[in-house]
Each structure stands twice: as C-alpha cells, then as structure tokens.
Amino acid sequence: HNTTVFQGVAGQSLQVSCPYDSMKHWGRRKAWCRQLGEKGPCQRVVSTHNLWLLSFLRRWNGSTAITDDTLGGTLTITLRNLQPHDAGLYQCQSLHGSEADTLRKVLVEVLADPLDHRDAGDLWFPGESESFEDAHVEHSISRSLLEGEIPFPPTS
C-alpha cells in the first residue's frame, strides 16, 4: 500500500477519506488505527457501528470520529481539534472476523496554526451548546508519499 499524506492545521479539524470497493468489503465493519512504530501493531482508535446497516452513524472516541458510506465505498475519519501529538501513521481497515485488511495507509501531518500569535479573543471556539456538526471543517490537503520517503524518521 502507498501512504497518503493528509495535512491539517493545529486546533482545526481534519477529514481523512479512505475509498474502497463497496462490493469487496460488503458487510464488513471498518476501523481507524494508529501505527505504533514502523513495524509495530496498529492500535485501534475507533470503529464503525456494530451493526453494519448503521455504519453511516458517526461514532466518536475522544476527538476522533468515524463514519462509513457503505454503498459509495468511502470511509471518513474526522480528527477534531488537531494537536501536534496527532501526527503519525494511521490505517483505515476493513474488519472480517480476526482479520483486518488495510484499505489505506495515512500519514497525518499537523501544521502550525498561522493565527496562534493572535489573542484568543480573536478565535472562534464552538460553545458548549453548539453542535460540532455545524462547525466548519477545513478541507484536508493530501498527497501520496514519494518513493523513498519514509513516514517514520530513522531512530538513532
């Protein structure tokens, strides 16, 4: 699998999309996991609804949400209030019994907020009563890693 890079701005939301063949993965739940090291396991962050028919319902784990368009074949992950520690390598997965097929490898890059030198009074934050659904989601910038690029820097 090639790795696709998604870039987001710190403090904003990042949407990651993972297209897949809807017929090939029919009836299967999906998951978003974080790769622990270059050859380490992929630690589950969030998975779609236990009932495949309800996969379109957004499920949250902390600041990460997942939703699946099972007919169109697009898994969408939203990382809310992106932070520098969210940067890293992830996978979109299709689950089948004890197996997990990789749909896409994703490298999340977090860019510094160009506004973070301003007073907090100039920034808008969703209030407690406001639904996050109505908040503006920044379009993510994505690209595939070039051959030879490595998602994990070599460790000394």
């Epitope: 063949d21 017929m23 029919w26 009932l51 028919l53 089948h96 019994g97 004890s98």
Partner: antibody
Framework: EVQLVQSGAEVKKPGESLKISCKGS????????IGWVRQMPGKGLEWMGI????????RYSPSFQGQVTISADKSISTAYLQWSSLKASDTAMYYC???????????????WGQGTMVTVSS | DIQMTQSPSTLSASVGDRVTITCRAS??????LAWYQQKPGKAPKLLIY???SLESGVPSRFSGSGSGTEFTLTISSLQPDDFATYYC??????????FGGGTKVEIK
C-alpha cells in the same frame, strides 16, 4: 440467469499440470468473491481458497497454500484453479462458488458450479 | 484456526420427524454461519445464511438459530426430499473458511 459453469472432467497422470475453470454469467463477475472447494470421494467438503476477481486479491486455506494456485481473468469472467504437479491424492470433485451479498450486509456462498471431477492415476 | 464440530455425523429419521443438527465453533464467529444441503453427485445448496436467514426458495420447514459458538439447523417436519447430507460453514474469516464434518440424514 446467474450461474457458474465449470470445465469438464479431467483424467491426468501424477506429476502432470492442470488448470480447471469456472465461468460466471448473469452478474457482474468482478464484484463478487469466488471460492473453491474440494470433495474427495466419499468425504466432506474442504475449503481451498477464495479470490476477488476485481483486483485478484486471493486468500488460501493453510492446508492448500503452496499446493494450488487460484487466479481469475476478469476479461472473460473466469476463475481458475491450477496444479503444477498433480498427485494421486488430488483425485476429487472440485466446486467453485460465488459469495453472494444481501441488503442486510450478510454474505453467503449462494451460487455453485456443477463441479469438475479430477482423477489422477498412473 | 477455528474448528467446526458438527453433530451427529449420522441421523436416522422418518418422514414427519423434527430433526435438529448442531454445529459448534471453537471460538465465537458471531453469525457468519451458513447451512448447506448436498445430495449425491450434486453441488451443495444454500439453505440458511447469517445463522438464521432463510435463502430465497428454500421451504420454511428449514430454520437456523444460534450465534457465537453454538448453532442449530432444524427441519420441522422431515420430507422425502430432505434425505441428504448437511454441512455448516463458518465464513467469519477468509483464511480459512471452515466446513463442519457433515451430517447424513438417512431413512430409519
């Protein structure tokens, strides 16, 4: 009509190679997994492996890994099961089956080929 | 690998009898289980999928139940056409997919 039609019976000698086929019709061949099943004379059903013709993703049962090769040619809606060197113990009926889908998200092997009898004898 | 243990291996019954066949999985397979009927010289025929859903065109005397590790196929009133061999199939995972050993239903 949705159907899978398999190639005819084969009689081979040990050590010979063989490729049997399973042609799908009446549905989008590239969009459904195709599995292969072995049934030795007087015995039960054994799973061999499965292929998704859309991208040729293939999974094998550990018992058959390295013993057979499963492939597909989507341009002619045909899946294949092949041996490079047959043994007498490969004598069996071989079935292909389509993994059908249901609106509930369920799947099942709903359509089966008529079977191909392979006899390996010196 | 998951093992599927089917019982009994042979069952003698009469027309009109209620027949129950059991399949046990060595670990949970949720409801990814199907039941097939096979007659001599013929390909298997799908009866039940998703543990309890009746395949289109299959008589309603056939029913399936169970989830997790224990599943049953029930024929409420055995008919002459039902004497055959029945197999359960676990397709919870593709490597491998596993059949039960089969149950031959014969005339008493």
């Amino acid at each position: 009509e949705v159907q899978l039609v398999q190639s005819g019976a084969e009689v081979k000698k040990p050590g010979e190679s063989l490729k049997i086929s399973c042609k799908g019709s009446g549905y989008s061949f590239t969009s459904y997994w195709i599995g292969w099943v072995r049934q030795m004379p007087g015995k039960g059903l054994e799973w061999m492996g499965i292929i998704y013709p859309g991208d040729s993703d293939t999974r094998y049962s550990p018992s058959f890994q390295g013993q057979v090769t499963i492939s597909a040619d989507k341009s002619i809606s045909t899946a294949y099961l092949q041996w490079s060197s047959l043994k007498a113990s490969d004598t069996a009926m071989y079935y292909c089956a389509r993994l059908g889908i249901y609106s509930t998200g369920a799947t099942a092997f709903d359509i089966w080929g008529q079977g191909t009898m392979v006899t390996v004898s010196s | 690998d998951i093992q599927m243990t089917q019982s009994p291996s042979t069952l003698s019954a009469s027309v009109g009898d209620r027949v129950t066949i059991t399949c046990r999985a060595s670990q949970s397979i949720s409801s990814w289980l199907a039941w097939y009927q096979q007659k001599p010289g013929k390909a298997p025929k799908l009866l039940i999928y998703d543990a309890s859903s009746l395949e289109s065109g299959v008589p309603s005397r056939f029913s399936g139940s169970g989830s997790g590790t224990e599943f049953t196929l029930t024929i409420s009133s055995l008919q002459p056409d039902d004497f055959a061999t029945y197999y359960c199939l676990d397709y919870n995972s593709y490597s491998p997919i596993t059949f039960g050993g089969g149950t031959k239903v014969e005339i008493k």
